[in-house]
């Protein structure tokens, strides 16, 4: 006579996280009396999904009424999957007895787990730099299951090839984590670019997720400066201006130095923007040569987004002027936007 | 679907008896034969449950002098050194009790002992 | 062993009573529920009317009713019909496979 068999189906399972999943079992005989208990995992540690005999257990029920007459059904439904959940589950028949003796095991069902990568979050470089150097982006995703996972990097649509992938743990585990590294150079038109994570997973059903960093967060574009004379607006006046051209961010402080002193400073606020995202500012400087027996160096001094200043100079040749007596200070005014403030 | 006992009969102190319990209908493999008696004018005496080789079990009374066995249609028990209190109807029920109650029962075969 | 104890050992009732069997373990049965109740008519075989303390057999009419979990159960009959004049006998399990004892029976009798 053939003794109980317990018949588990399925080698393995794969459910969605937050659907059941339905965990086949079946024995051949009801010899000998006593319940049928699932457990997650085998060995001492192994953890009780459910008990037939006894106990509460909220998430599990039986496919079958388990209190029917002639049941050989012990089917168990699990609610509300988590990653956590996933295993290799256990339906396991007792014999009764003081204490229950397990019996017989079935071979065991593989349950994984499918989850959803969570949005992928793009970090780029805690400082700015500039057009020419390489930065670096880093792209992470966690919670996932199973492993595979495909990641790509695109710099405006264009797929990049220069980053570098892990995803965590290398061994099993309940839900991995993928993080990604790509290294960007970056051009004085980049200031409007867009630096793209696609990640793509099997729960995604062909619909990847994506990240994105602005490259206007990283790029800092310094300017290009030109100092010109204006012609004379007037006897004794000379109107010299600065362009600054070409720059991003915004935020640019200027300095008129006459001779080496300070004559004016300001900071750029009314700025045109130019189709690459960069910016233009002009400021000029009223000169009245009238006030100088010399030469005037005229010096345009910019400090763009707290870095080190560059600057232009211009040489005020002003010997050619009559020198209108009793005046030693230069009257000037500064302009910005080549706004005409008279 | 039921079940049939035989093998009742008058027995002397001392002697042995095999009764024997055959389903009609269904198939025995998989469920256990519990035996239960009645002594005349009493209530039901559970005497134990025949599974298969390994799975056999009588009340602590019965250990001893009641043995069983089952192929997948007939249950046999074997009645040994048997007393004047063994005298009673034995039934044969399928079923091993907890979740498989006995159910169906067979009409029950009687064994009197005697000299 | 476990012992059960049935209580009243007889009982009469009319036609249409309600009638309440009570079956005690000497300890808590096996899983808690390891009760069934019996039918017997005089010259017949035992006949299954509930098991695991309330689960109703097949066939039975809904009339019958068991409940109770530990040591304590009860047998309900609703409302009495004149077929179930009758012994009624508890079956209680204990820890062990082997472990299987009858309560003495309570004989329903017409009043």
């Known amino acids: 006579e053939e003794e109980l068999q317990v018949i588990q189906p399925d080698k393995s399972v794969s459910v969605a996280a937050g659907e059941s999943a339905i965990l086949h079992c079946t024995v051949t005989s009801l010899i000998p009396v006593g319940p049928i208990q699932w457990f997650r995992g085998a060995g001492p540690a192994r953890e009780l999904i459910y008990n037939q005999k006894e106990g509460h257990f909220p998430r599990v029920t039986t496919v079958s009424e388990s209190t029917k007459r002639e049941n050989m059904d012990f089917s168990i439904s699990i609610s509300n999957i988590t990653p956590a959940d996933a295993g290799t589950y256990y339906c396991v028949k007792f014999r009764k007895g003081s204490p229950d003796t397990e019996f017989k095991s079935g071979a065991g069902t593989e349950l994984s787990v499918r989850a959803k990568p969570s949005a992928p979050v793009v970090s780029g470089p805690a400082a700015r730099a500039t057009p020419q150097h390489t930065v670096s982006f880093t792209c992470e995703s966690h919670g996932f299951s199973p492993r595979d996972i495909t990641l790509k990097w695109f710099k405006n649509g264009n797929e990049l090839s220069d980053f570098q992938t892990n995803v965590d743990p290398v061994g099993e585990s309940v839900s991995y984590s993928i993080h990604s590294t790509a290294k960007v150079v970056l051009t004085r038109e980049d200031v409007h670019s867009q630096v793209i994570c696609e990640v793509a997973h099997v729960t995604l059903q062909g619909d990847p997720l994506r990240g994105t960093a602005n490259l206007s967060e990283t790029i800092r574009v310094p300017p290009t400066l030109e100092v010109t004379q204006q012609p004379v607006r007037a006897e004794n006046q000379v109107n010299v201006t600065c362009q600054v051209r070409k720059f991003y961010p915004q935020r640019l402080q200027l300095t008129w130095l006459e001779n080496g002193n300070v004559s004016r400073t300001e900071t750029a606020s009314t700025v045109t923007e130019n189709k690459d995202g960069t910016y233009n500012w002009m400021s000029w400087l009223l000169v009245n040569v009238s006030a100088h027996r010399d030469d005037v160096k005229l010096t345009c001094q910019v400090e763009h987004d707290g870095q080190p200043a560059v600057s232009k100079s211009h040489d005020l040749k002003v010997s050619a002027h009559p020198k209108e007596q009793g005046s030693n200070t230069a009257a000037e005014n500064t302009g910005s936007n080549e706004r005409n403030i008279y | 679907r039921q079940l049939v006992e035989s093998g009742g009969g008058l027995v002397q102190p001392g002697g042995s008896l095999r009764l024997s319990c055959t389903a009609s209908?269904?198939?025995?493999?998989?469920?256990?034969i519990s035996w239960v008696r009645q002594a005349p004018g009493k209530g039901l005496e559970y005497i134990g449950t025949i599974g298969t080789g390994v799975i056999t079990y009588f009340a602590s009374w019965a250990k001893g002098r009641f043995t069983g066995s089952k192929t997948s249609s007939t249950a046999y028990m074997e009645l040994s050194s048997l007393r004047s209190e063994d005298t009673a109807v034995y039934f044969c029920a399928r079923g091993s009790a907890w979740n498989d109650p006995f159910d169906p029962w067979g009409q029950g075969t009687l064994v009197t002992v005697s000299s | 062993d476990i012992e059960m104890t049935q209580s009243p050992s007889s009982v009469s009732a009319s036609v249409g009573d309600r009638v309440t069997l009570t079956c005690q373990a000497s300890q808590s049965v096996y899983g808690n529920n390891d009760l069934a109740w019996y039918q017997q008519k005089p010259g017949q075989a035992p006949k299954l009317l509930i098991y695991?303390?309330?689960t109703l057999a097949t066939g039975v009419p809904s009339r019958f009713s068991g409940s109770g979990s530990g040591t304590d159960f009860t047998l309900t009959i609703s409302s009495l019909q004149p077929e179930d004049f009758a012994t009624y006998y508890c079956l209680g399990g204990g820890d062990d496979e082997a472990d299987n004892v009858f309560g003495g029976g309570t004989k329903v009798e017409i009043k």
């Open positions: 695991l303390a309330s």
């Open positions: 209908g269904f198939s025995l493999s998989s469920h256990g």
